[in-house]
Interface confidence: medium
């Protein structure tokens, strides 16, 4: 069953020209979901074996980190990875993480996109694809934005698209990125992509957004069947998380009620994820999704910040990229107030929507996303939403 996703009311985003690309977003008071509820088990997670294959399991190489692969696997057969829970304590996951280029036989580079004042939302996905419109703009700091994207320099050119057959649209954060779906202050000038059409259903044809100058060299239409147009008469948000409910084969069964303390779920159920994402509510088979942030060890110091990348305390020189000053922290750690701290610790909300932050050896920060009940989350930081409806 094709699932649909969006990042919390973000269906597509508009880049406004003339704005410094690396200032914190203005007028955005939204707060990220807090860390996992107290009492949740953050023990190590053993992934089932098996090769990564198919569109959902694409391993992508970050164009910004030369020669170093990063992982975004929906149902990863991590084999054995040394992971660290949010506290930074090492947790062993058996076996060895395969490098993406070994799995795919090639490195996958996201294509460049010409600068555009507006990035229209991607069209409806074809069955089997998952659409990941524009990740939610990180709220914590430019540092986190920079670390998350893994770029050695900010790219003000606009959205970055990951390799097409993953179908993930990941725009570079900019201070004035706003939701096309969110019309406040636009006075009718904003244009949104109404992606409410259920995947696989025929799209309508009226009011197509103007995408001239925005389509990359490989056409978006190669990825998806059609554009589902924005409904000009609907000036309220048109976010696919809210728009439609995914189809399921069986009627909903009773799910367990929240227990005292309001824990999200018994995390023990999450320790061995299944290979089938987006199970309907009440199936009793919640799954998790892991997403690695691009490695940070080649990033150097952070522009406009006193935080630099350094080795973890007590482990000088370990996992250092070649540098003259040796001031870099290990992957997934950043220098903060003179010491290397895990991004998981530094940013308690690093993984959105209740995702759990882990550190994976030689990979960096890793988010394990909740995939239960009516919605589940994916993306490098669990920022994207997929409904089980």
């Amino acid at each position: 069953v094709p699932a649909r996703e969006a990042g919390s009311a973000v269906e597509a985003e508009e880049l406004v020209k003339g704005s410094p690309a690396w200032e914190p977003p203005a007028n955005d008071t939204r707060e990220e979901a807090g860390p996992p509820a107290a009492g949740e088990d953050e023990a190590s997670w053993t992934a089932p074996g098996g090769e990564l294959a198919g569109p959902e399991e694409v391993l992508q190489e970050s164009a910004a980190v030369t020669g170093t692969a990063w992982l975004e696997a929906d149902s990863p057969g991590l084999g054995g990875v040394t992971a660290e829970a949010g506290s930074g304590d090492a947790q062993a996951l058996p076996a060895t993480l395969q490098a993406p280029h070994e799995v795919l036989g090639q490195s996958i580079m996201p294509p460049a996109i010409p600068e555009a004042t507006e990035a229209s939302g991607p069209p409806s996905p074809t069955p089997g694809d998952k659409l990941s419109p524009a990740s939610e703009l990180p709220k914590e700091s430019p540092l986190e934005v920079w670390l998350n994207l893994g770029g050695s320099t900010p790219d003000p050119q606009g959205p970055e698209l990951t390799y097409p057959f993953q179908g993930t649209l990941e725009p570079q954060p900019a201070s004035d990125i706003i939701d096309i779906d969110y019309f406040e202050g636009l006075d009718g000038e904003g244009r949104g992509a109404d992606l409410g059409s259920f995947p696989g259903s025929p799209g309508t044809s009226e009011n197509h957004p103007d995408t001239e100058g925005e389509t990359p060299s490989w056409s978006l239409l190669d990825l998806y069947d059609d554009f589902t147009p924005f409904d000009e008469s609907d000036f309220y948000p048109t976010t696919s998380f809210y728009d439609d409910l995914d189809e399921e084969e069986e009627e909903e069964e009773d799910d367990k009620d929240a227990v005292g303390g309001g824990d999200l779920e018994d995390e023990n159920e999450l320790l061995v994820p299944t290979g089938k994402p987006g199970l309907g509510p009440g199936t009793g088979q919640p799954t998790s999704r892991w997403h690695a942030v691009p490695p940070q060890h080649t990033l150097g110091s952070v522009p406009g910040s006193s935080i630099a990348l350094r080795p973890r305390p007590g482990e000088p020189g370990r996992d250092l990229a070649s540098s003259e000053n040796g001031t870099e922290c290990r992957s997934g750690f950043v220098r903060h107030n003179g010491s290397c701290r895990s991004v998981c610790d530094l940013f308690p909300s690093y993984c959105h929507n209740g995702g759990q932050c882990y550190l994976v050896e030689n990979i960096g920060a890793f988010c394990r996303c909740n995939t239960q009940d009516y919605i589940w989350h994916k993306g490098m930081r669990c920022e994207s939403i997929i409904t089980d409806f």
């Epitope: 948000p237 998380f241 439609d244 009620d257 409806f389």
Partner: antibody, heavy 116, light 111 residues
């Protein structure tokens, strides 16, 4: 302009049945999940049921599960709520609303009174 | 399926600012950024005024703002006006069985 117009409410005895309809216009009906939300007199809002754009998935609040059935006819741009085994506590204004969680458009509501 | 908790009533004078709270749990308000607020005049249908914790739909006055801290979401109305007198309902996505949870509603009186 998006419009939702409910009908079918009225007075019914406990144990009786009613079928509510919601005629939609101004948007691509089949592209959106639709919901029923009710409001008992002097009370807050209560989500009742939701249905996917194609009608393939339906969800219900526990309080109505097994008694109410949500459906839609996309060719007629109409949403339905079949209510059986009605109880006094089902007395409320029933609203149809666009989408399933973020209700950006609402109908004017139709009053269902369950009383003997 | 207990509702989100809102104060039954709040009042304020014209020009003042008032805040209406909406308290839930980690399975709803605290766990997700999917809190919405609706304004409802007597005898009328609700109207969306805030979504995703703090976003305003087009046409909604910027005197309305939303925020969230932990288990509690808040709606703040600044520069209170007579036409703000209405009922205000919060809602949140909720995990486990019930995807949409509403608050009990808060009656705002402008003195």
């Amino acid at each position: 302009e998006v419009q939702l117009l409910e009908s079918g409410g009225g007075l019914v005895q406990p144990g009786g049945s009613l079928r509510l309809s919601c005629a939609a216009s101004g948007f691509t009906f089949s592209s959106y999940a639709m919901s029923w939300v009710r409001q008992a007199p002097g009370k807050g809002l209560e989500w009742v049921s939701a249905i996917s754009g194609s009608g393939g998935s339906t969800y219900y609040a526990d309080s109505v599960k097994g008694r109410f059935t949500i459906s839609r006819d996309n060719s007629k741009n109409t949403l339905y709520l079949q209510m059986n085994s009605l109880r006094a506590e089902d007395t409320a204004v029933y609203y149809c609303a666009k989408k399933w969680n973020l209700f950006d458009y609402w109908g004017q509501g139709t009053l269902v009174t369950v009383s003997s | 399926q207990s509702a989100l908790t809102q104060p039954a009533s709040v009042s304020g004078s014209p020009g003042q600012s008032i805040t209406i709270s909406c308290t839930g749990t980690s399975t709803d308000v605290n766990g997700y950024n999917y809190v919405s607020w609706y304004q409802q005049y007597a005898g009328k249908a609700p109207k969306l005024i805030i979504f995703d914790v703090s976003k305003r739909p087009s046409g909604v006055s910027n005197r309305f703002s939303g925020s969230k801290s932990g288990d509690t979401a808040s709606l703040t109305i600044s520069g209170l006006q007579a036409e703000d007198e209405a009922d205000y309902h919060c809602s949140s996505y909720r995990r486990l069985r019930l995807p949409v949870l509403f608050g009990g509603g808060t009656k705002l009186t402008v003195l």
